[in-house]
Amino acid sequence: GITQSPKYLFRKEGQNVTLSCEQNLNHDAMYWYRQDPGQGLRLIYYSQIVNDFQKGDIAEGYSVSREKKESFPLTVTSAQKNPTAFYLCASSI
Protein backbone atom coordinates (compact mmCIF):
# COMPACT_ATOMS: atom_id res chain seq x y z
CA GLY A 1 0.00 0.00 0.00
CA ILE A 2 0.89 3.65 0.35
CA THR A 3 1.46 5.33 3.69
CA GLN A 4 1.46 9.01 4.51
CA SER A 5 2.54 10.44 7.83
CA PRO A 6 1.84 12.20 10.05
CA LYS A 7 -1.94 12.42 9.91
CA TYR A 8 -1.90 15.86 11.53
CA LEU A 9 0.91 18.36 11.81
CA PHE A 10 1.31 21.77 13.41
CA ARG A 11 4.06 24.04 12.12
CA LYS A 12 5.72 26.79 14.09
CA GLU A 13 6.22 30.03 12.20
CA GLY A 14 9.46 30.06 10.24
CA GLN A 15 9.90 26.30 10.47
CA ASN A 16 10.34 23.67 7.75
CA VAL A 17 8.28 20.52 8.18
CA THR A 18 8.47 17.28 6.22
CA LEU A 19 5.61 14.98 5.27
CA SER A 20 6.50 11.37 4.61
CA CYS A 21 5.11 9.27 1.79
CA GLU A 22 6.13 5.61 1.43
CA GLN A 23 4.86 2.96 -0.99
CA ASN A 24 5.67 -0.72 -1.41
CA LEU A 25 3.79 -1.14 -4.68
CA ASN A 26 6.88 -0.95 -6.90
CA HIS A 27 5.38 2.16 -8.51
CA ASP A 28 7.71 4.43 -10.47
CA ALA A 29 5.57 7.56 -10.25
CA MET A 30 4.71 9.46 -7.07
CA TYR A 31 2.77 12.70 -6.59
CA TRP A 32 2.01 15.31 -3.93
CA TYR A 33 -1.23 17.27 -4.03
CA ARG A 34 -2.68 20.03 -1.91
CA GLN A 35 -6.37 20.58 -1.27
CA ASP A 36 -7.71 23.76 0.24
CA PRO A 37 -11.23 23.96 1.72
CA GLY A 38 -13.88 23.96 -0.99
CA GLN A 39 -11.32 23.45 -3.76
CA GLY A 40 -10.03 20.56 -5.85
CA LEU A 41 -6.65 18.89 -5.69
CA ARG A 42 -3.70 20.89 -7.00
CA LEU A 43 -0.42 19.24 -7.94
CA ILE A 44 2.64 20.39 -5.98
CA TYR A 45 5.40 18.08 -7.27
CA TYR A 46 5.64 14.74 -9.01
CA SER A 47 8.37 12.19 -9.67
CA GLN A 48 8.46 9.56 -12.37
CA ILE A 49 11.76 7.83 -11.58
CA VAL A 50 14.25 7.77 -8.73
CA ASN A 51 16.27 10.99 -8.41
CA ASP A 52 14.10 12.95 -10.80
CA PHE A 53 11.15 15.18 -10.03
CA GLN A 54 9.21 18.01 -11.62
CA LYS A 55 7.28 20.99 -10.32
CA GLY A 56 3.53 20.88 -10.43
CA ASP A 57 1.22 23.90 -10.50
CA ILE A 58 1.98 25.18 -6.99
CA ALA A 59 5.58 24.19 -6.20
CA GLU A 60 6.62 27.48 -4.63
CA GLY A 61 7.37 27.07 -0.93
CA TYR A 62 7.81 23.30 -1.19
CA SER A 63 10.70 20.96 -1.87
CA VAL A 64 10.94 17.22 -2.48
CA SER A 65 13.50 14.47 -2.93
CA ARG A 66 13.31 11.02 -4.50
CA GLU A 67 16.34 9.21 -3.16
CA LYS A 68 14.67 5.84 -3.51
CA LYS A 69 11.75 4.36 -5.38
CA GLU A 70 9.67 3.74 -2.29
CA SER A 71 9.82 7.22 -0.79
CA PHE A 72 8.86 10.76 -1.82
CA PRO A 73 9.01 13.16 1.16
CA LEU A 74 7.56 16.64 0.81
CA THR A 75 9.06 19.53 2.77
CA VAL A 76 6.85 22.51 3.46
CA THR A 77 9.42 25.27 3.72
CA SER A 78 9.31 28.44 5.76
CA ALA A 79 8.78 30.27 2.46
CA GLN A 80 5.30 28.73 2.23
CA LYS A 81 3.27 31.46 3.91
CA ASN A 82 -0.08 29.70 3.78
CA PRO A 83 0.63 26.03 4.50
CA THR A 84 -2.66 25.12 6.16
CA ALA A 85 -4.30 22.57 3.88
CA PHE A 86 -5.00 18.88 3.30
CA TYR A 87 -2.01 17.15 1.63
CA LEU A 88 -2.38 13.99 -0.39
CA CYS A 89 0.33 11.69 -1.70
CA ALA A 90 -0.35 9.27 -4.55
CA SER A 91 1.57 6.77 -6.65
CA SER A 92 1.09 5.02 -9.98
CA ILE A 93 2.84 2.57 -12.27
Epitope: I49, N51, D52, Q54, E67, K68, K69
Partner: antibody, heavy 120, light 112 residues
Framework: QVQLQESGPGLVKPSETLSLTCTVS?????????WNWIRQFPGKGLEWIGY???????NYNPSLKSRVTISRDTSKNQFSLKLSSVTAADTAVYYC?????????????WGQGTTVTVSS | DIQMTQSPSSLSASVGDRVTITCRSS???????????LHWYQQKPGKAPKLLIY???NRFSGVPSRFSGSGSGTDFTLTISSLQPEDFATYYC?????????FGQGTKLEIK
Protein backbone atom coordinates in the same frame (compact mmCIF):
# COMPACT_ATOMS: atom_id res chain seq x y z
CA GLN B 1 28.44 16.69 0.75
CA VAL B 2 28.99 13.22 -0.72
CA GLN B 3 32.62 12.23 -1.20
CA LEU B 4 33.93 9.15 -2.98
CA GLN B 5 37.41 7.65 -2.93
CA GLU B 6 38.65 4.74 -5.05
CA SER B 7 41.32 2.32 -3.88
CA GLY B 8 42.96 -0.76 -5.35
CA PRO B 9 46.01 -1.98 -7.24
CA GLY B 10 47.28 0.10 -10.12
CA LEU B 11 48.77 -2.87 -11.99
CA VAL B 12 46.94 -6.07 -12.93
CA LYS B 13 48.26 -8.98 -14.97
CA PRO B 14 46.40 -10.14 -18.11
CA SER B 15 43.74 -12.82 -17.45
CA GLU B 16 43.56 -11.84 -13.76
CA THR B 17 40.75 -10.03 -11.93
CA LEU B 18 40.75 -6.27 -11.41
CA SER B 19 39.40 -5.33 -7.97
CA LEU B 20 38.62 -1.79 -6.85
CA THR B 21 36.75 -0.38 -3.86
CA CYS B 22 34.96 2.94 -3.47
CA THR B 23 34.57 4.38 0.01
CA VAL B 24 31.67 6.81 0.39
CA SER B 25 31.48 9.49 3.06
CA UNK B 26 28.75 12.02 3.77
CA UNK B 27 25.89 9.73 2.78
CA UNK B 28 24.80 6.16 3.44
CA UNK B 29 24.77 4.04 0.29
CA UNK B 30 21.63 2.28 1.57
CA UNK B 31 19.72 5.56 1.91
CA UNK B 32 19.23 6.04 -1.81
CA UNK B 33 20.59 6.64 -5.29
CA UNK B 34 22.78 4.60 -7.61
CA TRP B 35 26.48 3.94 -7.10
CA ASN B 36 28.31 3.75 -10.41
CA TRP B 37 31.60 2.66 -11.91
CA ILE B 38 32.75 4.52 -15.02
CA ARG B 39 36.08 4.18 -16.80
CA GLN B 40 38.04 6.43 -19.12
CA PHE B 41 40.39 4.93 -21.66
CA PRO B 42 43.79 6.44 -22.52
CA GLY B 43 42.21 7.85 -25.70
CA LYS B 44 39.83 9.76 -23.38
CA GLY B 45 36.62 7.86 -24.23
CA LEU B 46 34.24 7.30 -21.30
CA GLU B 47 32.42 4.01 -20.65
CA TRP B 48 29.75 3.30 -18.07
CA ILE B 49 30.46 -0.06 -16.41
CA GLY B 50 27.39 -0.38 -14.19
CA TYR B 51 25.89 0.47 -10.82
CA UNK B 52 24.66 -0.97 -7.59
CA UNK B 53 21.46 0.57 -6.26
CA UNK B 54 20.61 1.59 -2.70
CA UNK B 55 18.67 -1.68 -2.39
CA UNK B 56 21.57 -3.82 -3.61
CA UNK B 57 20.25 -4.45 -7.11
CA UNK B 58 22.60 -4.15 -10.08
CA ASN B 59 22.56 -2.82 -13.61
CA TYR B 60 25.53 -3.60 -15.85
CA ASN B 61 26.75 -2.59 -19.28
CA PRO B 62 25.84 -5.62 -21.45
CA SER B 63 29.22 -5.44 -23.16
CA LEU B 64 30.90 -6.24 -19.80
CA LYS B 65 28.15 -8.18 -18.04
CA SER B 66 29.85 -11.58 -18.29
CA ARG B 67 33.00 -10.24 -16.59
CA VAL B 68 31.77 -7.64 -14.10
CA THR B 69 30.44 -7.78 -10.54
CA ILE B 70 29.56 -4.73 -8.45
CA SER B 71 28.92 -5.48 -4.79
CA ARG B 72 28.77 -3.52 -1.54
CA ASP B 73 29.75 -3.65 2.11
CA THR B 74 27.12 -1.61 3.92
CA SER B 75 28.96 -1.83 7.26
CA LYS B 76 31.89 0.07 5.72
CA ASN B 77 29.75 2.20 3.37
CA GLN B 78 31.74 0.89 0.41
CA PHE B 79 30.96 -0.57 -2.99
CA SER B 80 33.33 -2.57 -5.12
CA LEU B 81 34.11 -3.49 -8.70
CA LYS B 82 35.46 -6.81 -9.89
CA LEU B 83 36.35 -7.24 -13.56
CA SER B 84 37.60 -10.68 -14.52
CA SER B 85 39.80 -11.95 -17.36
CA VAL B 86 41.31 -8.55 -18.01
CA THR B 87 43.32 -7.67 -21.10
CA ALA B 88 45.33 -4.62 -22.12
CA ALA B 89 42.06 -3.16 -23.46
CA ASP B 90 40.89 -2.76 -19.85
CA THR B 91 43.71 -0.30 -19.10
CA ALA B 92 41.91 2.89 -18.03
CA VAL B 93 41.24 5.39 -15.28
CA TYR B 94 38.43 3.94 -13.15
CA TYR B 95 36.02 6.30 -11.41
CA CYS B 96 33.30 5.64 -8.88
CA UNK B 97 30.47 8.14 -9.15
CA UNK B 98 26.96 8.89 -7.98
CA UNK B 99 24.19 11.19 -9.17
CA UNK B 100 23.46 14.63 -7.87
CA UNK B 101 20.02 15.00 -6.28
CA UNK B 102 17.20 15.67 -8.70
CA UNK B 103 19.20 15.29 -11.92
CA UNK B 104 17.89 11.93 -13.08
CA UNK B 105 20.91 9.69 -13.51
CA UNK B 106 23.39 12.49 -14.26
CA UNK B 107 26.42 11.95 -12.02
CA UNK B 108 28.34 14.76 -10.40
CA UNK B 109 29.90 13.17 -7.35
CA TRP B 110 33.08 11.51 -8.58
CA GLY B 111 36.08 9.90 -6.99
CA GLN B 112 39.49 11.24 -7.99
CA GLY B 113 39.96 8.27 -10.32
CA THR B 114 42.48 5.46 -10.11
CA THR B 115 44.67 4.44 -13.03
CA VAL B 116 44.72 0.71 -13.70
CA THR B 117 47.26 -0.71 -16.11
CA VAL B 118 46.93 -4.27 -17.41
CA SER B 119 50.37 -5.60 -18.19
CA SER B 120 52.52 -8.64 -17.51
CA ASP C 1 23.60 0.54 -27.50
CA ILE C 2 22.84 4.19 -28.18
CA GLN C 3 25.67 5.81 -30.12
CA MET C 4 26.41 9.42 -29.19
CA THR C 5 28.20 11.40 -31.90
CA GLN C 6 29.68 14.79 -31.09
CA SER C 7 30.86 17.40 -33.53
CA PRO C 8 33.32 18.84 -33.95
CA SER C 9 35.91 16.57 -32.31
CA SER C 10 38.10 19.59 -31.68
CA LEU C 11 37.58 23.29 -31.92
CA SER C 12 39.84 26.34 -31.71
CA ALA C 13 38.28 29.55 -30.45
CA SER C 14 39.18 32.81 -28.74
CA VAL C 15 38.10 34.34 -25.46
CA GLY C 16 34.76 36.08 -26.00
CA ASP C 17 33.69 33.82 -28.86
CA ARG C 18 30.31 32.11 -29.00
CA VAL C 19 30.79 28.35 -29.36
CA THR C 20 28.31 25.60 -30.18
CA ILE C 21 28.95 21.87 -29.77
CA THR C 22 26.47 19.38 -31.17
CA CYS C 23 25.56 15.88 -30.04
CA ARG C 24 23.48 13.42 -32.04
CA SER C 25 22.12 10.14 -30.69
CA SER C 26 21.42 7.03 -32.76
CA UNK C 27 17.91 6.76 -31.22
CA UNK C 28 15.50 9.12 -29.55
CA UNK C 29 16.44 9.97 -25.97
CA UNK C 30 12.85 10.62 -24.90
CA UNK C 31 12.15 8.32 -21.97
CA UNK C 32 8.80 6.55 -21.61
CA UNK C 33 8.06 9.11 -18.88
CA UNK C 34 8.50 11.87 -21.51
CA UNK C 35 11.69 13.29 -19.96
CA UNK C 36 14.93 13.42 -21.95
CA UNK C 37 18.01 12.35 -20.03
CA LEU C 38 20.73 14.05 -22.05
CA HIS C 39 23.55 15.67 -20.07
CA TRP C 40 26.73 17.67 -20.73
CA TYR C 41 30.03 17.41 -18.85
CA GLN C 42 33.22 19.44 -18.82
CA GLN C 43 36.56 17.77 -18.13
CA LYS C 44 39.95 19.33 -17.53
CA PRO C 45 43.24 17.37 -17.74
CA GLY C 46 43.82 15.06 -14.79
CA LYS C 47 40.39 15.75 -13.29
CA ALA C 48 37.07 13.90 -13.21
CA PRO C 49 34.29 15.24 -15.47
CA LYS C 50 32.02 17.93 -14.02
CA LEU C 51 28.30 18.13 -14.69
CA LEU C 52 27.30 21.30 -16.56
CA ILE C 53 23.81 20.64 -17.94
CA TYR C 54 21.32 17.92 -17.07
CA UNK C 55 18.14 16.87 -18.84
CA UNK C 56 18.94 18.84 -22.00
CA UNK C 57 18.72 22.39 -20.69
CA ASN C 58 18.98 22.55 -16.90
CA ARG C 59 22.12 24.28 -15.67
CA PHE C 60 23.65 22.44 -12.75
CA SER C 61 24.22 24.29 -9.48
CA GLY C 62 27.03 26.83 -9.74
CA VAL C 63 27.38 26.62 -13.53
CA PRO C 64 27.68 30.09 -15.13
CA SER C 65 24.78 31.37 -17.22
CA ARG C 66 26.98 31.53 -20.34
CA PHE C 67 26.48 27.75 -20.62
CA SER C 68 23.17 26.64 -22.11
CA GLY C 69 21.77 23.45 -23.56
CA SER C 70 18.99 22.82 -26.05
CA GLY C 71 17.60 20.20 -28.39
CA SER C 72 15.14 17.34 -28.48
CA GLY C 73 14.75 13.78 -29.68
CA THR C 74 18.13 12.93 -31.20
CA ASP C 75 19.78 16.34 -31.75
CA PHE C 76 21.25 18.45 -28.96
CA THR C 77 23.56 21.42 -28.57
CA LEU C 78 25.73 22.95 -25.88
CA THR C 79 26.35 26.66 -26.32
CA ILE C 80 28.91 28.84 -24.56
CA SER C 81 27.82 32.39 -25.22
CA SER C 82 31.11 34.14 -24.47
CA LEU C 83 34.16 31.97 -23.91
CA GLN C 84 36.20 32.57 -20.79
CA PRO C 85 39.79 31.37 -20.25
CA GLU C 86 38.62 28.69 -17.81
CA ASP C 87 36.27 27.17 -20.42
CA PHE C 88 39.05 25.62 -22.47
CA ALA C 89 38.52 21.93 -21.75
CA THR C 90 36.97 18.79 -23.21
CA TYR C 91 33.17 18.51 -23.33
CA TYR C 92 31.15 15.30 -23.37
CA CYS C 93 27.48 14.62 -23.92
CA UNK C 94 25.94 11.63 -22.17
CA UNK C 95 22.59 9.86 -22.17
CA UNK C 96 20.93 8.00 -19.31
CA UNK C 97 17.58 7.31 -20.97
CA UNK C 98 18.63 3.86 -22.15
CA UNK C 99 20.86 1.21 -20.56
CA UNK C 100 23.75 1.08 -21.11
CA UNK C 101 24.34 4.74 -20.37
CA UNK C 102 26.67 6.10 -23.04
CA PHE C 103 28.90 9.09 -23.73
CA GLY C 104 29.94 11.04 -26.77
CA GLN C 105 33.58 10.83 -27.85
CA GLY C 106 34.28 14.35 -26.60
CA THR C 107 34.96 17.79 -28.09
CA LYS C 108 38.27 19.38 -27.20
CA LEU C 109 38.00 23.16 -27.02
CA GLU C 110 41.37 24.82 -27.49
CA ILE C 111 42.63 28.39 -27.47
CA LYS C 112 43.11 29.87 -30.93
Amino acid sequence: QVQLQESGPGLVKPSETLSLTCTVSGYSITSGYFWNWIRQFPGKGLEWIGYISYDGSNNYNPSLKSRVTISRDTSKNQFSLKLSSVTAADTAVYYCASPSPGTGYAVDYWGQGTTVTVSS
Amino acid sequence: DIQMTQSPSSLSASVGDRVTITCRSSQSLVHSNKNTYLHWYQQKPGKAPKLLIYKVSNRFSGVPSRFSGSGSGTDFTLTISSLQPEDFATYYCSQSTHVPFTFGQGTKLEIK
